[in-house]
Structure formats: C-alpha cells, structure tokens
Interface confidence: low
C-alpha cells in the first residue's frame, strides 16, 4: 500500500514542475541552492533559478529534448558548477564539481555548514521592511527563502514554503494596519521563535538518518506516531514510518522536490485514511496542503483505546516471545515499541527507546540460554529506574526554574555545562545553555503527564546543536563520547558527566572583560547574552569557583552596567569602573 | 544489518552480455535510489547507472544506450542488463543505495570484457 509507487517518468525535471507547480519549484530550488552554496549573493541564486526553471518549461513541453532525462542531481550540480567564484569563495568544495553523480552531491551534502560566517539578521524599520514589500513582493519572499535557507541548510524545505506564505499573510495585513509596528513585530518574533525551533528539530532527523542510519530513525518514528495515533493498527503505523522515512531522507539528502512532493502525497494519504489513523485530524484535513501538512505534523495525540491488555501477556508471559523474535526480529520489536508508546504519551520517544533497547538486550541474552522465559521474566523490572531516571531529574529542573526564572536558571545551566566540557567555545556554550534553559518555560508549566515528553525530547534537539556545531569543530572528547555512542543516551551521558578536572584553567585576559557604552543600546536579550558570554568566561578562568562566588561577581557586574548606563559620561564610567570591577572580581574569586 | 550481494558477473568477448543482479537487505529498498558502480585499479569509484525509487533510470554517457538498470522492490533486487560490451568496461562491478545515509556496498562481481 506504498503513497510512492510511481511510473518510471521521461524527464524527472518535468515531473517535478508539473506536480509541485511553478511558483512552489521555484521555491524549493531557490532553498536547495542557498542551502548548498551558503555565501552566494543573492541575485546570483535568482539567475540560477530561473535558468533551471526556464529548461524545466522545455521538459514539460516536450520530456524528449536534450538533458531533459538528466536526473536532478546532475541537471542542479551542473547548474552550481557553472558559478565563477566557486573556488575562491568556497575553496575545497570546487572540488566536488570533478566528481560525477552521485558522488558530486555527497560532497555537496557534506560541506554544508551549520555555523556559516554570515553577518546576523538585522531587522530593519517597519516602514522600510513595508515598502520593500509593495514595491516587490516576489523578490521580498524569495529573499526570505534564501535567507533563512542559507543559515539553515538541513531547514525543512517544504515547511520552509509554510514559513513563507505566514511571512507573507503578516506583511499583507500589517502593512495596511494603523499600528504597523504593533501589527507586525510580534508576528516577525513568533516567526523567527517558531522558526530557529522547527529548524532545530529538523536537523535531528536528519542527524539521526546521517550517523545512525535508517533503522534508528524508523524506531524514532514508530514510538512517536505510536503515541499519537494510538488507534491505529500497526501495520498502518509501519506504512506511514515508512513513507515518512522516504521524505525526511529525500529533505535530509538535499532531493527537495522530491521530498515536497512526497510530502504532499503523505498528507493526501492520511486524510483518505483518518478513520483507520487518527480521531483528531479532522480539522487540519480542512486546510490547504501548507497548512495541512504542518497541521498533521503538529497534531495532538489521539485518546488511547480503553480496552488495551496488559503488555506482559505478549512480551514476557507468552512461550512464544523467543519463537517471534528469532522470526523477525525488527518486526517483533516494532510491535513492542508500538504497544510500549501506544500506552505511554507520558514518556519521551528516547526514553521509549531505551526500553526496548533494554527488551532487544535482554531477548538477545535470554533467547541463547537454557530456560530462556525464567530468563527474560523480569524484564519489565529493569525498566524502572530508566524512567525514574528522567522523572526525578524534571521534577529536580523544573523546582529550580520555578525558583530561579528563566535567565538565572540559563545561568545555572551555564555554569554546570562550562564545567562538564569547559573545551568548547563560549558563544556555542552560551547558544546551548540558553536554548537548554528554555525548557524551563516550555515544559514545567505542563502537568505530570506531558512533562517528560516536552522537556527530554526538547532536551534531545538541543543537545544535538551542541553535537553538530562540535562536529565541525571537535575540541572535547566527552562531548564526542556523548554525541557518537548512542542517540537515544546523549542527554542521559551528558547530565553523568562531572566536572573535567584535566581542564587547564584559561589565562586571565583582561580584554575579556572590558565593556563599552555600546551595552547600553542593546536590548535586554543582547544585554543578557554579553552577561551570559562573562560568565562562561570566568568559569574558565576559575573553574573551581563556587555558585555564591560566581553570584557574587556577577550581581556586582549587573550594578556596573546600571550604574555605567545611567552615567552621563557613559564611556568614562565604563573605562574606569570596569577596571575596579576586574580588581574586584579577580580578589573575589582568587585570581 | 545493511547488506548487498551482487552476481552475474564473468567474462565475455567484446559485443557480449551479461546480466548482472544485486540482491539488497537489512534496509527498506523499495523507498532509496540505487546505483551500480565501477571499480578500475588505481581509479575512482564511478557510477554506471543509478534508478530512482519511482523507477525512473539515469545512465553514464559510457554506457548510456548499452546497458539498462531495472528494480523489482518486491524481490529487493536491482539489475544491470549490460549489452555490446567493450573492454574499456572491465571492472568490479557493485551496487548501493546512492544516499549517504548508508556508507554499504556488496564485494562486487568482476566483469572483464576480452577477446
């Protein structure tokens, strides 16, 4: 019952432009190409675009013209090797263009970059962003696209296209608004929150596709759309894991026409099938395909049946659990992950699975031995300090956000990561304790019941920036540990770690320390973030300094930039105070 | 466990055929693209052909009108029908999925064309 069965097609290119339409071909292939060639001026990707969607015509006109049976990898490698500045502006990857497909687009795919060196976003006035907008609004969008694509490069692309038409909707309205500023801003920051997040969950899909393969991300997908779909059959969980394993590969892989297509045809296939998936997609079966395909994605669990039995019967009780796995084993511990997550919304996915790694361990062990069911019997037994584990660390984080707030919570964290893997650079410590913090405000709000699966799966994204921005640039042998052993055990081996006492503390630099009238101007998140970058750094100066030491220094650096900001001589105060203020603290904390 | 066992490979006059199959496991075949490569000593690995999980086949120019790639997903199988050889097609020839995703490939099967 594969979506995806498809005739054989003449022209790849053409079957493409016709399924997605031109104004969503034109789209993705813009993404595809920001997403590959990050530096590359914006007017340069245009050119490229509309050449390839103008040999595209050719195809759908007639499939039989020259190139038109290329296959897209070769007609868009092609298409990026034909830049001029491709050498001088990317060095090695000009090497990728004396490859033949598919290697050329491995070696695309692997010089992606997840910290490109591209200037921050600066918002400009409301009345200026307006204008812009009326006076063209297809450039204005396609800027969006290759902005956010190009910073992004594993973003979702065909929920890139959904970002978009919001982004769009927000300037249509909010332009013609009395209040513009009123109308638009918050828009603009609920996209740009929503956006750094669904971005971040992406790149662990594809993460999880990259470095631990298929099968690992199949078993992701079973427990998850086991939870929210726990009415439906397995074997129609398996289908749709299987075709949802087809699309995140296509994206993951850079095959963005395919992967929107396929998409597309995903969310076709639920909507036929709602009665046999789930209860609750009634209304998001309703909306256009954008807006539908985000909405089955977003969807909220289906009630659980009433009648479920008790897992025993059919994993530990039975005589046969030996006989079925050695059968088919993936099959077998497919159907336990289903009926294990069915039953438990309450738990993450990585917890789920690492309970059936536990089964999968025990039945590997038990199924060689003499009396293979006295065995296995207490399996269920060793599951419950795996879920203690999490249980009591949320109830410990979430009492210490309530008691903290968000930002010195941030701090908290800050200074418990800084001291596990004081190796890694300042601003990626700052980025990840301030995203690890924000689980604070996301999930301790929740009830019991959803606190786990909002708060360690959230944990689980996060902690995967740190893994991809390391990857680039490994410095710490625990953080590769953590990162590379297991995917469903990174944020369990992180929370064991203690504090690295090989680490050399850093050499006290004054520099370091030094600020400027410019603080003042900043806003309160910027101002937070150069607080934040100070404490990172003093914890690597001293990394032995208690919490009231650290406190203490740094409340008297908030009293100095009040203080600084209010003077009349701003950057005199700044000069001046600042020098007592690093006397102080390096008295306070032993330097 | 990802693995891929290629056969029907031997030797042949120039102008002869050979068919040549890859038989994949331990992945969901029906939904990755495939391709058949060749290796030469002291070459780089190239790509012969590779087919689309939809069906829809893409040649090398060197065997583009020679050779035919083909897919039975129900047998997760994919085939290499090679006509009028040359000797400039001697190699070991494997398959694979063309997705990074897998770093796999069979041993491949020695196909030399000679007179």
């Known amino acids: 019952r594969g979506v995806f069965r498809r005739d054989a097609h003449k022209s790849e290119v053409a079957h493409r432009f016709k399924d997605l339409g031109e104004e969503n071909f034109k789209a993705l292939v813009l993404i595809a190409f920001a997403q590959y060639l990050q530096q590359c001026p914006f007017e340069d990707h245009v050119k490229l675009v509309n050449e390839v969607t103008e040999f595209a015509k050719t195809c759908v006109a007639d499939e039989s013209a020259e190139n038109c049976d290329k296959s897209l990898h070769t007609l868009f490698g092609d298409k990026l090797c034909t830049v001029a500045t491709l050498r001088e502006t990317y060095g090695e990857m000009a090497d990728c263009c004396a490859k033949q497909e598919p290697e050329r687009n491995e070696c695309f795919l692997q010089h992606k970059d997840d910290n490109p060196n591209l200037p921050r976003l600066v918002r400009p006035e409301v009345d200026v962003m307006c204008t812009a907008f009326h006076d063209n609004e297809e450039t204005f969008l396609k800027k969006y696209l290759y902005e956010i694509a190009r910073r992004h490069p594993y973003f979702y692309a065909p929920e890139l296209l959904f970002f978009a038409k919001r982004y769009k909707a927000a300037f249509t309205e909010c332009c013609q608004a009395a209040d513009k500023a009123a109308c638009l801003l918050p828009k603009l920051d609920e996209l740009r929150d929503e956006g750094k997040a669904s971005s971040a969950k992406q790149r662990l899909k594809c993460a999880s596709l990259q470095k631990f393969g298929e099968r690992a991300f199949k078993a992701w997908a079973v427990a998850r759309l086991s939870q929210r779909f726990p009415k439906a059959e397995f074997a129609e969980v398996s289908k749709l894991v299987t075709d949802l394993t087809k699309v995140h590969t296509e994206c993951c892989h850079g095959d963005l026409l395919e992967c929107a297509d396929d998409r597309a045809d995903l969310a076709k296939y639920i909507c036929e099938n709602q009665d046999s998936i789930s209860s609750k997609l009634k209304e998001c079966c309703e909306k256009p395909l954008l807006e539908k395909s985000h909405c089955i994605a977003e969807v909220e669990n289906d009630e659980m049946p009433a009648d479920l039995p008790s897992l025993a019967a059919d994993f530990v009780e039975s005589k046969d659990v030996c006989k079925n796995y050695a059968e088919a084993k993936d099959v077998f511990l497919g159907m336990f992950l289903y009926e294990y997550a069915r039953r438990h919304p309450d738990y993450s996915v990585v917890l789920l699975l690492r309970l059936a790694k536990t089964y999968e361990t025990t039945l590997e062990k038990c199924c060689a031995a003499a009396d293979p069911h006295e065995c296995y019997a207490k399996v269920f037994d060793e599951f419950k300090p795996l879920v203690e584990e999490p249980q009591n660390l949320i109830k410990q984080n979430c009492e210490l956000f309530e008691q903290l707030g968000e930002y010195k919570f941030q701090n908290a964290l800050l200074v418990r990561y800084t001291k596990k893997v004081p190796q890694v650079s300042t601003p990626t410590l700052v980025e990840v304790s301030r995203n690890l913090g924000k689980v604070g405000s996301k999930c301790c709000k929740h009830p019991e019941a959803k606190r786990m699966p909002c708060a360690e799966d959230y944990l689980s994204v996060v902690l995967n920036q740190l893994c991809v921005l390391h990857e680039k640039t490994p410095v710490s042998d625990r953080v590769t540990k953590c990162c590379t052993e297991s995917l469903v055990n990174r944020r369990p081996c992180f929370s064991a770690l203690e504090v690295d006492e090989t680490y050399v503390p850093k050499e006290f630099n004054a520099e370091t320390f030094t600020f400027h009238a410019d603080i003042c101007t900043l806003s309160e998140k910027e101002r937070q973030i150069k607080k934040q970058t100070a404490l990172v750094e003093l914890v690597k100066h001293k990394p032995k300094a208690t919490k009231e030491q650290l406190k203490a220094v740094m409340d008297d650096f908030a009293a100095f930039v009040e203080k600084c900001c209010k003077a009349d001589d701003k950057e005199t105060c700044f000069a001046e105070e600042g020098k007592k203020l690093v006397a102080a603290s390096q008295a306070a904390l032993g330097l | 466990q990802v693995q891929l066992q290629e056969s029907g490979g031997g030797l042949v006059q120039p102008g002869g055929s050979l068919r040549l199959s890859c038989k994949a496991s331990?992945?969901?075949?029906?939904?990755?693209?495939m391709g058949w490569y060749r290796q030469v000593p002291g070459k780089e690995r190239e790509a012969v052909a590779t087919?689309?999980?939809?069906?829809?086949?893409f040649y090398a120019n060197s065997a583009s009108g020679r050779f035919t790639i083909s897919r039975d997903n129900a047998k997760s199988t994919v085939y290499l029908q090679m006509n009028n050889l040359k000797p400039e097609d001697t190699g070991v020839y494997s398959c694979?999925?063309?997705?990074?995703?897998?770093?796999?490939q069979g041993q491949g099967t020695q196909v030399t064309v000679s007179s």
């Open positions: 694979s999925p063309i997705t990074s995703i897998f770093k796999a």
């Open positions: 331990g992945f969901t075949f029906s939904i990755y693209s």
């Open positions: 087919i689309s999980s939809g069906g829809s086949p």
